[in-house]
């Protein structure tokens, strides 16, 4: 049994640090294998993590973390049985994947003006909390084409825009997700998407 | 209430052994890390020895290091310390404390916030 | 390894005055988290050590309010705002960041 790809990992720099692998052949990943990681840090004591299947030879480890800070430093051991397959190191904070915004809420009854609102995946004293930057996405469902990225470089989690700038009479569906510059962080996964009828009152041509 | 009780303390020639043991009560022992402190006649505190609560980390001062061994016997919630070739320079009152938290990720630490009472150890010929 | 520095080594205090002992570290003894690791103990004549103040500036239970600790990085202070009778013994500065932990070389508080 030998790791074809080597561990991987992101931290969401709050409470879990997700790490993946390939092995170099089909593995039951929970019974075979285990992930075994530890701060270093006096005193602290080595931990279990044990893997899910992610494809037939891909397995995936979600580590458990009290909370994150930039000097933290692990060491990864993956162990089948006795046998030590792979030894490594991660520093959560470069390598963060921020969570996913929550609970996006499109209101429409503000004139003809799109509010987008959605809530910051942080508690207020994590420090992503306040260094979250975020893009929405909107698209037709009955238009492919109709595809559009705002980018919301201010720390409120919400967007206006004009209903104008959408097409009336049809559906749109809108998603947001977030990263932060200061940790150079990927992007989130996107949140679940919301949808809503586009209907605005056409301005009165006068001729 | 939290008590810590030292014992195995005594006179031995040099090169000789003793093993110290500190029985605990008041507290998830397997829960916590455990530490020895030692101190010579009219001199000031030293740190000897400390175990993580599962065991499974142990650091020495280097003074001791390759002599003394430091264990733990979570279901007789006791700490040990084994002292071999003992020299004069190991003569002081030894000390078991109280350390941080350390079965969660980040060991949680609020000082060595309870002592034994001490046990003498004296090397002399 | 962190070397611990006191001063005073003695102090001769007038009871109900204030006390002040310095300990400084050779190396930082603060942690990414913020918490410094450094704790002072109180040893009186024939007693084991006792926890006062731990990572920094927390004073342990049971202790006196009278006493408080300050500092972060490489300086530390331990004041007494008001000095008892009972307060006499040897105070000791330790860091706990990194093995080995090291002790302060010990200040005797002493009444005039």
């Known amino acids: 049994m030998k790791v074809l790809q080597e561990p991987t990992c992101v931290s969401d720099y709050m409470s879990i640090s997700t790490c993946e692998w390939k092995m170099n052949g089909p593995t039951n990943c929970s019974t075979e294998l285990r992930l075994l990681y530890q701060l270093v840090f006096l005193l602290s004591e080595a931990h279990t993590c044990i893997p899910e299947n992610n494809g037939g030879a891909g397995c995936v480890c979600h580590l458990l973390m009290d909370d994150v800070v930039s000097a933290d430093n692990y060491t990864l051991d993956l162990w089948a049985g006795q046998q030590l397959l792979w030894k490594g190191s991660f520093k959560p904070s470069e390598h963060v994947k921020p969570r996913a915004p929550g609970n996006l809420t499109v209101h429409t009854n503000v004139s003809d003006t799109l509010l987008l609102t959605w809530s910051n995946p942080y508690p207020p004293d994590n420090y992503l909390y306040n260094h979250l930057t975020y893009a929405v996405n909107i698209w037709s469902e009955n238009d492919p084409a109709d595809f559009r990225i705002y980018n919301v470089t201010y720390l409120e989690p919400s967007l206006r825009i004009a209903a104008s700038t959408l097409k009336s009479g049809i559906s749109y569906r809108a998603r947001v997700r977030a990263w932060a510059q200061c940790y150079n962080t990927t992007w989130s996964e996107w949140s679940p998407s919301t949808k809503w009828h586009n209907s605005y009152r056409e301005p009165f041509e006068q001729h | 209430e939290v008590q810590l009780v030292e014992s195995g303390g005594g006179l031995v020639q040099p090169g000789g052994s003793l093993r110290l043991s500190c029985a605990v009560s008041g507290f998830t022992f397997s829960s916590y890390a455990m530490s020895w402190v030692r101190q010579a006649p009219g001199k000031g505190l030293e740190w000897v020895s400390s175990?993580?609560?599962?065991?499974?980390?142990?650091y020495y001062a280097d003074s001791v290091k390759g002599r003394f061994t430091i264990s733990r016997d979570n279901s007789k919630n006791t700490v040990y310390l084994q002292m071999n070739s003992l020299r004069a320079e190991d003569t002081a009152v030894y000390y078991c404390?109280?350390?941080?938290?350390?079965?969660?990720?980040?060991?949680?630490?609020?000082?060595?916030?309870?002592w034994g009472q001490g046990t003498t150890v004296t090397v002399s010929s | 390894d962190i070397v611990m520095t006191q001063s005073p080594l003695s102090l001769p205090v007038t009871p109900g005055e204030p006390a002040s002992i310095s300990c400084r570290s050779s190396r930082n003894v603060i942690y990414g988290n913020g918490y410094n690791y450094l704790d002072w103990y109180l040893q009186k004549s024939g007693q084991s050590p006792q926890l006062l103040i731990y990572?920094?500036?927390n004073v342990a239970a049971g202790v006196p309010d009278r006493f408080s600790g300050s500092g972060s990085g490489t300086d530390f202070t331990l004041k007494i705002s008001r000095v008892e009778a009972e307060d006499v013994g040897f105070y000791y500065c330790?860091?706990?960041?990194?093995?080995?932990?090291?002790f302060g070389q010990g200040t005797k508080l002493e009444i005039k």
């Open positions: 404390a109280k350390d941080r938290i350390s079965i969660t990720i980040r060991p949680r630490y609020f000082g060595l916030d309870f």
């Open positions: 330790m860091q706990s960041l990194q093995a080995p932990y090291t």
């Open positions: 990572l920094g500036n």
């Open positions: 175990i993580t609560g599962g065991g499974g980390g142990i």
